[in-house]
């Protein structure tokens, strides 16, 4: 008898080169086979759960940068006037509730902020828990 | 055929409000639906394993902070001289383990101290080990 | 019928108590029993997924570190000039790639480097997903 | 020198919606909790809500739970309190306040006025 | 929810000494905050730490806390200490204030 197989976990890593002033990052999905989405810049969060949060990036210039995941919530992440982050993070997160960026720079100049290495990865924690596709 | 679902892993979030000098956190565990539990103050260790440990929270004054799981062991947190904690570490924990607050201020008052967001979620990363229930 | 279980995870802790100037760390896996193997003094990966990775370390003079994965590829971690380590990252690894060390000692000294509590933890994140044994 | 200025009170209708800014300035904003206090008229003060430092942790009282989220703007060193389904009960003085050690309030701004009336 | 109870009104006489009281539950195991509150004006933290006065308040304010009553005393009310005085503590994540008590100079 075959051992039983682990369905595939939720997990995503998205990618961002580039966020705007006063609104997020613009965030894609380097890989076709990502157990996640992407929709409207934002993670869809299908299966409750905890999930572990990475997120990296260096920044062309000074921002303060949130990460939120529900409407009225606080933020997953909060750095104020920094020039990069990396940082890991454990949250419960539920169906839909939906991952993403908010940006504020502090330059006159409303340009975009220009981002290296810029990456985002969940990872769901309690597989068995509820989903919802 | 129906393919496997997971058996749910074992994981818990705690919140706690007040320290008490020279002891501990009071935790309490706000879902009923937690695959861990909460007694005499600790959180009991079923599985053997390795453990994501994320600790979060505000205090109202300065204080030093140990988290241990074991007597005799050293600590999985220790933070000293702190008004804040946002931490995330992995350590291997077995079963008959048991995860518990020590505290101690600085001030000459021996008053609770209170904690606004105080969290820590444990969340067990080797289903398929031994448990003991 | 029996619920079905968990296949082990693929995990390890390795300790190293001792780190050569311009070359790695001495890595040994204190268990019989991990489910990834160390070759080389290196940890080999045979599944593709995020890892959960956990370094410390207190080591006995002043050094540059960092760990690979991938010739030619950046570092899972660099820290510049520390005496002390303690990290937790997030990176997507995969078969064939080798978890390793690289160290560095700004001292005319060529002597070893001694470590104190020198440990190093993956966890793979993605059971179900390509492994190659 | 600490200051904190509010503003965003006006007269509303119940069921309507308002969003008091606290702009500070005087101290690092990052770095310390905030508070909304209210006082509705000829009363006394009624703590509304918290924020942590970093603005992800929050706190309600009771009678604003569900209905009012506080959030912080590092960036711009402000302070803010969005009010929704508003009834008469919520006139009042809108203080925000920054909590020193001990969870005390060791600075105030001077208040603006929430009106609810139909 | 916790409860802090305070006397509505006291009324002293100009230099005597006036204790305004704040009772709650074991109030003793809390850090007891005090306020000051001017008609019109926003309120200014007066004693911290039960006891403790911050920089600019003067002496004749002192404070006090044990079992289940804290104590804010002014040792020689002037006019200028007429005023509502709050006390404030701090319990499972949420801020609590006592009813307050106007204090009246005669």
């Known amino acids: 008898q075959v051992p039983p197989q682990y369905p595939p976990i939720q997990s995503i890593r998205v990618q961002f080169t580039r966020c705007e002033n006063e609104k997020g990052c613009i965030i894609t999905s380097p890989s076709k086979d990502e157990t996640m989405k992407v929709q409207d810049n934002s993670i869809i969060i299908n299966c409750d759960g905890f999930y572990l949060i990475s997120l990296k990036g260096y920044f062309s210039e000074e921002l303060s940068l949130s990460l939120y995941y529900r409407k009225g919530r606080g933020p997953l992440f909060s750095l104020s006037k920094v020039t990069s982050v990396d940082s890991i993070g454990v949250a419960y997160l539920a169906f839909k509730d939906k991952v993403y960026f908010n940006v504020t720079t502090h330059s006159t100049s409303y340009k975009d902020i220009q981002v290296n290495g810029g990456e985002l990865i969940l990872i769901h924690q309690n597989p068995g828990g509820f989903c919802a596709y | 055929q129906v393919p496997p679902q997971y058996p749910p892993i074992q994981s818990i979030r705690v919140q706690f409000t007040r320290c008490e000098n020279e002891k501990g956190c009071i935790i309490t565990s706000p879902s009923k639906d937690e695959t861990m539990k909460v007694q005499d103050n600790s959180i009991i260790i079923n599985c053997d394993g390795f453990y994501l440990i994320s600790l979060k929270g505000y205090f109202s004054e300065e204080l030093s902070l140990s988290l241990y799981y074991r007597k005799g062991r050293g600590p999985l947190f220790s933070l000293s001289k702190v008004t804040s904690v946002d931490s995330i570490g992995v350590a291997y924990l077995a079963f008959k383990d048991k995860v518990y607050f020590n505290v101690t201020t600085h001030s000459t008052s021996y008053k609770d101290i209170q904690v606004n967001g105080g969290e820590l979620i444990l969340i067990h990363q080797n289903p398929g080990g031994f448990c003991a229930y | 019928q029996v619920p079905p279980q968990y296949p082990p995870i693929q995990s390890i802790r390795v300790q190293f108590t001792r780190c050569e100037n311009e070359k790695g760390c001495i890595i040994t896996s204190p268990s019989k029993d991990e489910t990834m193997k160390v070759q080389d003094n290196s940890i080999i990966i045979n599944c593709d997924g995020f890892y959960l990775i956990s370094l410390k370390g207190y080591f006995s003079e002043e050094l540059s570190l960092s760990l690979y994965y991938r010739k030619g590829r950046g570092p899972l971690f660099s820290l510049s000039k520390v005496t002390s380590v303690d990290s937790i990252g997030v990176a997507y690894l995969a078969f064939k790639d080798k978890v390793y060390f690289n160290v560095t000692t700004h001292s005319t000294s060529y002597k070893d480097i001694q470590v104190n509590g020198g440990e190093l933890i993956l966890i793979h994140q993605n059971p179900g997903g390509f492994c190659a044994y | 020198e600490v200051k904190l200025v509010e503003s965003g009170g006006d007269l509303v209708k119940p069921e309507g919606s308002l969003r008091l800014s606290c702009v500070v300035s005087?101290?690092?904003?990052?770095?310390?909790?905030m508070s909304w206090v209210r006082q509705a008229p000829g009363k006394g003060l009624q703590w509304v809500a918290y924020i942590s430092s970093d603005g992800r942790s929050s706190s309600y009282t009771d009678a604003v739970q569900g209905r009012f989220t506080i959030s912080s703007d590092n960036a711009k060193n402000t302070l803010y309190l969005q009010m929704n389904s508003l009834t008469t009960e919520d006139t009042a003085v809108y203080y925000c306040a920054k909590l020193g050690r001990g969870f005390n309030f060791n600075f105030w701004g001077q208040g603006t006025l929430v009106t609810v009336s139909s | 929810s916790y409860v802090l109870t305070q006397l509505p009104s006291k009324n002293v006489t100009l230099k005597q000494p006036a204790h305004i009281t704040c009772g709650g539950d074991?109030?003793?195991?809390?850090?007891v905050h005090w306020y000051q509150q001017k008609l019109g004006q926003a309120p200014v933290l007066i004693i911290y730490?039960?006891?403790s006065r911050p920089t600019g308040i003067p002496e004749r304010f002192s404070g006090a806390n044990s079992g289940n009553t804290a104590t804010l005393t002014i040792s020689g009310a002037l006019a200028e200490d007429e005023a509502d005085y709050y006390c404030q503590v701090w319990d499972s994540s949420a801020s609590v204030f006592g009813g307050g008590t106007h204090l009246t100079v005669l």
């Open positions: 005087g101290f690092t904003f990052s770095r310390y909790g």
């Open positions: 074991n109030i003793g195991s809390k850090s």
């Open positions: 730490y039960d006891s």
